[in-house]
C-alpha cells in the first residue's frame, strides 16, 4: 500500500536535485580559486541535513548553520548589488561588471539559484512530487528559510555604498513584501552602509517618467532614512544602453543620460 | 574631483561661539555623509560624528554632545561645525571628511584658537 | 569603545629600508571576513591621507610602496622601501564599531 504523502500547492523538489548541487558546489569551486578548499560533499550534507526528516513547514534558520559555515564566504563589502524581480538583468550586469557581486554569485546563492527542495518529517526521502508555496501553505518551508538567512547575512555583509537594481516596470517598483524589501533592507548595517543607491530600471523605450519620484520609491527611501543610511535613486531608461556601457564605458555615446 | 573645502582660521575667546564651514564640490552632497574630525595641538585624530547629508540627521561621539552641533544647507553644498560656549581645550584644528568609515577626502582643515 | 594601540610610538628608518607599523585592538574589527581597519599619512600642516582601507586595499594613487595585513585584532603597515618623503605621522583607524576610534599615532623619521 503506497505510503500517504502531503500534498503541498507548490512544485516539488526539482528533479535531480542533489547531482545538481554537487554539480555547481563542483563547477563554482573550480571557476572561483578562493574556494577551492571546499568539500562539496559535506556541503551537500549539510544542505541535505538542513531539511531532510524535518516537516517543511517547520524549517528554521539554524537548521541552515552547518551550510551556512561550511559556505562562508569573503567578497568585497563595497561591491554588492542587490536587485529584487530584475534577477536576469542584475546577473547580465555582474557578469559584465566582473567585480560586483549578486547573492547568487556567490557559492551557496549559486547552489540555490532557480532550485526547489523539500523533504517529509520522519522519513530521509526527498519530496520531488509537491512543497509548501509560501502564500498558500507556510512560509518556514525550506526554499523561503534559505533565502531569508542568505539574503540577511549578504546585507549584513554590506558596506559602503550598496546598489539595488529595481524593476520599474512593475506596479510595486519597491516591494515591502520581497525578500529586498523585508530581509536584505533591514539589515543594512547603518555604521557600514553610507548609502543605499537605487537604479529603477525601465521597461518601455518611450517611458521618460522620472521613476525616482514613484510613491513605492519615496517608501524605500523613508525606510532607508529612518536607518540613518543615506539614500540615491537613478532612473536606468535604456537597461540594454546600460549594460552595452558598462562593457564599452569608454564609447561616446556613453556619456549621455542612460 | 571631489574637494572639501573648509572657511579660514578663527581666534575667539572663551565662552564665545564659532561655525566652520565646509564646502563640498565635485559630487552631489547629499549622496555620502560629513564627518568631523578634531586634532589639537600636537595631538591624535578624534572622530567627533557625522551627519546624513540626506536626512540632516547628527550623529555626535559621546564626547562631543552639547556644545557640538553639525549642520547643513545643502543648497550650497556646505555642512557646517558650530560650538559654541568655546573652552581653552577648544583649540584645535577641525577637518570635515568624508564617507562613513574610512575617509578618503579631507578639508584642509581649519584651525580654531580659544584664547582670552 | 574600541581601543587602538599603535606601537612603536617612533622609529627611524634608512632609506631603501623596510618599516613596519603595528596597530593592536582592544576587540576584533572584523565583519563577515572584511577588516575594517584603515592606515592614514599625515605631514604637518596637512589633512591626513587615506593609504589603505579595510586592512589590505590600496587606495588609488598610493604607491605599492605601501601595503596593509592583518585580521581581527592585529594589523600591520609596512613601508618598502622607504623613501625620503615618508616622513610622516601614520595613524591607524576602525570603523567597524561606532565610535570611529584612532590609534595614537607612530612618528615615522627617515635617517
Known amino acids: 500500500v503506497p505510503r500517504w504523502r502531503q500534498q503541498w500547492s507548490g512544485p516539488g523538489t526539482t528533479k535531480r536535485f542533489p547531482e545538481t548541487v554537487l554539480a555547481r558546489c563542483v563547477k563554482y569551486t573550480e571557476i572561483h580559486p578562493e574556494m577551492r578548499h571546499v568539500d562539496c560533499q559535506s556541503v551537500w550534507d549539510a544542505f541535505k541535513g538542513a531539511f531532510i526528516s524535518k516537516h517543511p513547514c517547520n524549517i528554521t534558520e539554524e537548521d541552515y548553520q552547518p551550510l551556512m559555515k561550511l559556505g562562508t564566504q569573503t567578497v568585497p563589502c563595497n561591491k554588492i548589488l542587490l536587485w529584487s524581480r530584475i534577477k536576469d538583468l542584475a546577473h547580465q550586469f555582474t557578469q559584465v561588471q566582473r567585480d560586483m557581486f549578486t547573492l547568487e554569485d556567490t557559492l551557496l546563492g549559486y547552489l540555490a539559484d532557480d532550485l526547489t527542495w523539500c523533504g517529509e518529517f520522519n522519513t530521509s526521502k526527498i519530496n520531488y512530487q509537491s512543497c509548501p508555496d509560501w502564500r498558500k501553505d507556510c512560509s518556514n518551508n525550506p526554499v523561503s528559510v534559505f533565502w531569508k538567512t542568505v539574503s540577511r547575512r549578504f546585507a549584513e555583509a554590506a558596506c559602503d555604498v550598496v546598489h539595488v537594481m529595481l524593476n520599474g516596470s512593475r506596479s510595486k517598483i519597491f516591494d515591502k513584501n520581497s525578500t529586498f524589501g523585508s530581509v536584505e533592507v533591514h539589515n543594512l548595517q547603518p555604521e557600514k552602509v553610507q548609502t543605499l543607491e537605487a537604479w529603477v530600471i525601465h521597461g518601455g523605450r518611450e517611458d521618460s517618467r522620472d521613476l525616482c519620484q514613484d510613491p513605492t520609491i519615496k517608501e524605500l527611501e523613508s525606510i532607508i532614512s529612518k536607518r540613518n543610511i543615506q539614500f540615491s535613486c537613478k532612473n536606468i531608461y535604456r537597461p540594454d544602453k546600460f549594460l552595452q556601457c558598462v562593457k564599452n564605458p569608454e564609447d561616446s555615446s556613453c556619456t549621455s543620460e542612460i | 574631483q571631489v574637494q572639501l573645502v573648509q572657511s579660514g582660521s578663527e581666534l575667539k575667546k572663551p565662552g564665545a561661539s564659532v561655525k566652520v564651514s565646509c564646502k563640498a564640490s565635485?559630487?552631489?552632497?547629499?549622496?555620502?555623509?560629513m564627518n568631523w574630525v578634531r586634532q589639537a595641538p600636537g595631538q591624535g585624530l578624534e572622530w567627533m560624528g557625522w551627519?546624513?547629508?540626506?536626512?540632516?540627521?547628527?550623529t555626535y561621539a559621546d564626547d562631543f554632545k552639547g556644545r557640538f552641533v553639525f549642520s547643513l544647507d545643502t543648497s550650497v553644498s556646505t555642512a557646517y561645525l558650530q560650538i559654541s560656549s568655546l573652552k581653552a581645550e577648544d583649540t584645535a584644528v577641525y577637518y570635515c571628511?568624508?564617507?562613513?568609515?574610512?575617509?578618503?577626502?579631507w578639508g584642509q582643515g581649519t584651525l580654531v584658537t580659544v584664547s582670552s | 569603545d574600541i581601543v587602538l594601540t599603535q606601537s612603536p610610538a617612533s622609529l627611524a628608518v634608512s632609506p631603501g629600508q623596510r618599516a613596519t607599523i603595528t596597530c593592536r585592538t582592544s576587540?576584533?574589527?572584523?565583519?563577515?571576513?572584511?577588516?575594517?581597519m584603515h592606515w592614514y599619512q599625515q605631514k604637518p600642516g596637512q589633512p591626513p591621507k587615506l593609504l589603505i582601507y579595510?586592512?589590505?586595499n590600496l587606495e588609488s594613487g598610493v604607491p605599492a610602496r605601501f601595503s596593509g595585513s592583518g585580521s581581527g585584532t592585529d594589523f600591520t603597515l609596512t613601508i618598502n622601501p622607504v623613501e625620503a618623503n615618508d616622513t610622516a605621522n601614520y595613524y591607524c583607524?576602525?570603523?567597524?564599531?561606532?565610535?570611529?576610534?584612532f590609534g595614537q599615532g607612530t612618528k615615522v623619521e627617515i635617517k
Open positions: 571628511a568624508r564617507y562613513p568609515g574610512w575617509f578618503a577626502y
Open positions: 565635485g559630487y552631489n552632497l547629499t549622496n555620502y555623509g
Open positions: 551627519i546624513n547629508t540626506y536626512t540632516g540627521e547628527p
Open positions: 576587540e576584533s574589527v572584523d565583519s563577515y571576513g572584511n577588516s575594517f
Open positions: 579595510r586592512a589590505s
Open positions: 583607524q576602525q570603523s567597524n564599531e561606532d565610535p570611529w576610534t
